[in-house]
Interface confidence: low
């Protein structure tokens, strides 16, 4: 059938120490997030249909001002990538919070059934869990 | 019929005092903006078909430098939300102009026929009306 | 046939002196970039099917810190536009790197067969060629 696979997720929590991944959640009971095709595996988004996808993300840092992002030696960085299967591991999209408190971007990329996407936030600042400030989604656009 | 509803709008003007909304306009006579399905109601975008939409926006502040955005106690913030009907009022997407002069983002969200989207710009700085710097659009992507 | 035209490009190189254009490349052999419908003409993206397109871009500056973007009198600016045919020349999307090192945005715009899109980066800073930091793409979304 025509691939309508689509998902929009909201932040659930950050990972334990040494785990830079953001953990996502989705579903109408949670608000305006949803999964229609893709699925969540321990908070990470797994693709179920091959194709080219538009991947988009916005992450806003909590307790943030331009000084809090600029005064760190190691800038806070957000990377979206395929983290499994290991043979397909790759960084798809990467941004740093220089003197800002929000990053937002999007890109087209081929994804395959079974690809699990990870969103790694490195640095000491915390992401906002407000649903209009931090979200992550994919949309199948063609085979 | 298959939902191809789509719109791309350009800024018309800001609201009067105490009205933080941006007022939009669209149509080929104005340039590269258009409405095909959605409609404008007093400068606000109204949805005419249920579905999941990709909502995107870029707003650039006029007469802006990184010092003008950082020196205000009240940061300039842009929020896109459903403002009517009141029962569905919600903030969908929110960004602050910390030390920057442009925000741009996008997200997938379910919208229903009759939902009116508002774009609220709070703060004392004015948005640019250049059509390549400030624009707002929606695209129906699936039922 | 139904228009599935789509492309995602990675940066090849910057132009020679006095040429602000970025030169792009795409194809599976290069990584995750591809052209399915549109084509490249000397590193510039040419549209082959009329329609409304979602145009998106992310550009990250190399060897960049918030001070390197803020200390220039003339801010580094990225503009995406139609550069040929000359009769249709127009700026579609424009952003400045104020105190940041990455810009990312997207917009819907009508494009016609034969339109060539140029991405002009003005300023003295160089863009990163990392494929997860700098990319440019278009997606046909409706007639």
């Amino acid at each position: 059938s025509l691939g309508w696979d689509i998902a929009e997720l909201q932040l659930n929590h950050t990972g334990p120490q040494q785990d830079p991944r953001l953990y996502w959640q989705g579903g109408p009971a949670l608000g305006r997030s949803f999964l229609r095709g893709p699925e969540l595996d321990k908070g990470q988004l797994r693709i179920r249909r091959d194709g080219i996808y538009m991947v988009h993300i916005q992450v806003t840092l909590a307790i943030c001002s331009s000084t809090s992002t600029s005064r760190h030696h190691h800038p806070t960085t957000l990377a979206v990538g395929i983290c499994s299967p290991a043979s397909r591991s790759i960084s798809l999209l990467r941004l740093s919070f220089h003197q800002g408190c929000t990053i937002a971007s999007q890109r087209l990329t081929p994804l395959a059934r079974g690809d699990t996407l990870c969103t790694n936030l490195t640095g000491t600042l915390l992401p906002s869990r407000n649903t209009d400030e931090t979200f992550f989604g994919v949309q199948w656009v063609r085979p | 019929s298959l939902g191809w509803d789509i719109a791309e709008l350009q800024l018309n003007h800001t609201g009067p005092q105490q009205d933080p909304r941006l007022y939009w306009q669209g149509g080929p006579a104005l340039g590269r903006s258009f409405l095909r399905g959605p409609e404008l109601d007093k400068g606000q975008l109204r949805i005419r078909r249920d579905g999941i939409y990709m909502v995107h926006i870029q707003v650039t502040l006029a007469i802006c430098s990184s010092t003008s955005t950082s020196r205000h106690h009240h940061p300039t913030t842009l929020a896109v939300g459903i403002c009517s009907p009141a029962s569905r009022s919600i903030s969908l997407l929110r960004l602050s102009f910390h030390q920057g002069c442009t925000i741009a983002s996008q997200r997938l969200t379910p919208l229903a026929r009759g939902d009116t989207l508002c774009t609220n710009l709070t703060g004392t700085l004015l948005p640019s009306r250049n059509t390549d710097e400030t624009f707002f659009g929606v695209q129906w992507v699936r039922p | 046939s139904l228009g599935w035209d789509i492309a995602e490009l990675q940066l090849n190189h910057t132009g020679p002196q006095q040429d602000p254009r970025l030169y792009w490349q795409g194809g599976p052999a290069l990584g995750r970039s591809f052209l399915r419908g549109p084509e490249l003409d000397k590193g510039q993206l040419r549209i082959r099917r009329d329609g409304i397109y979602m145009v998106h871009i992310q550009v990250t500056l190399a060897i960049c810190s918030s001070t390197s973007t803020s200390r220039h009198h003339h801010p580094t600016t990225l503009a995406v536009g139609i550069c040929s045919p000359a009769s249709r020349s127009i700026s579609l999307l424009r952003l400045s790197f104020h105190q940041g090192c990455t810009i990312a945005s997207q917009r819907l715009t009508p494009l016609a067969r034969g339109d060539t899109l140029c991405t002009n980066l003005t300023g003295t800073l160089l863009p990163s060629r990392n494929t997860d930091e700098t990319f440019f793409g278009v997606q046909w979304v409706r007639p």
Epitope: H13, G31, A62, R129, N130 | I90 | -
Partner: antibody, heavy 131, light 118 residues
Framework: QVQLQESGPGLVKPSQTLSLACTVS??????????WSWIRQPPGKGLEWMGA???????YYSPSLKTRTSISRDTSKNQFTLQLSSVTPEDTAVYYC???????????????????????WGQGTQVTVSS | QSVLTQPPSLSASPGSSVRLTCTLS?????????ISWYQQKAGSPPRYLLY?????????GSGVPSRFSGSKDPSANAGLLLISGLQAEDEADYYC???????????FGGGSKLTVLG
């Protein structure tokens, strides 16, 4: 450095309305990511959250005090005010104002917040309810 | 509304470590809650110590020594405040506070009085 200072009458008669102001210096009460709370502490007892006002003026109240509590603000004075109506001797307490980090957003029937921590407190003002 | 239980009092010797608990009532999983901790000395307002949601979602108050740390004990459905290298100046009342993302009603525990012996 953010500083908060409570002010108001030390003695209020039963059935009257208690009004306390909190003046903030070193930061604006309209700054995003903060909201502004009132907390009280009866003699020899623990802390009780009464309510808060957000950076955009939204108000939140403790369910047990909701019918008697009102919080407002005057941005020109950088001040927020607590009003507690129909007071009784049980309302005798030290009243604190505090800044809270963690902006609240209301979405789809639920409140979401980034953090919830009372990071700056006033010195407190003693209020006695007695005839 | 969550009910938080703290032991009314506890005591420990200087230099030792102490663990203060903040137990949520049944039906409220500690994993879903943000917990913040406050110290109050006699005659003074409370002071913010730290906030804890998970090991990487936490925040230490300005000027608060690293001797103070937070954690959770899911088996006891409790938030924990750990104080190591106990000092005489740590003698105070300690309060926990929680709020979860389904409501906005911050609740404080009843407080624990910590006595430093000797």
């Amino acid at each position: 450095q953010v500083q908060l200072q409570e002010s108001g009458p030390g003695l209020v008669k039963p059935s009257q309305t208690l009004s306390l102001a909190c003046t903030v210096s070193g930061g604006s009460i309209t700054t995003s990511y903060y909201y502004w709370s009132w907390i009280r502490q009866p003699p020899g007892k623990g802390l009780e959250w009464m309510g808060a006002i957000g950076s955009r003026g939204s108000t939140y109240y403790s369910p047990s005090l909701k019918t008697r509590t009102s919080i407002s603000r005057d941005t020109s004075k950088n001040q927020f005010t607590l009003q507690l109506s129909s007071v009784t001797p049980e309302d005798t307490a030290v009243y604190y104002c505090a800044r809270v980090t963690g902006e609240i957003t209301y979405n789809s029937g639920s409140y979401y917040y980034t953090l919830n921590l009372f990071d700056y407190w006033g010195q407190g003002t003693q209020v006695t309810v007695s005839s | 509304q969550s009910v938080l239980t703290q032991p009314p009092s506890l005591s420990a010797s200087p230099g030792s470590s102490v663990r203060l608990t903040c137990t949520l009532s049944s039906g409220n999983s500690v994993g879903n809650y943000d917990i913040s901790w406050y110290q109050q000395k006699a005659g003074s307002p409370p002071r913010y110590l730290l906030y804890y949601y998970s090991d990487s979602y936490k925040n230490q108050g300005s000027g608060v020594p690293s001797r103070f740390s937070g954690s959770k004990d899911p088996s006891a459905n409790a938030g924990l405040l750990l104080i190591s290298g106990l000092q005489a100046e740590d003698e105070a009342d300690y309060y926990c506070s929680v709020s979860n993302s389904g409501t906005y009603k911050p609740v404080f525990g009843g407080g624990s009085k910590l006595t430093v012996l000797g």
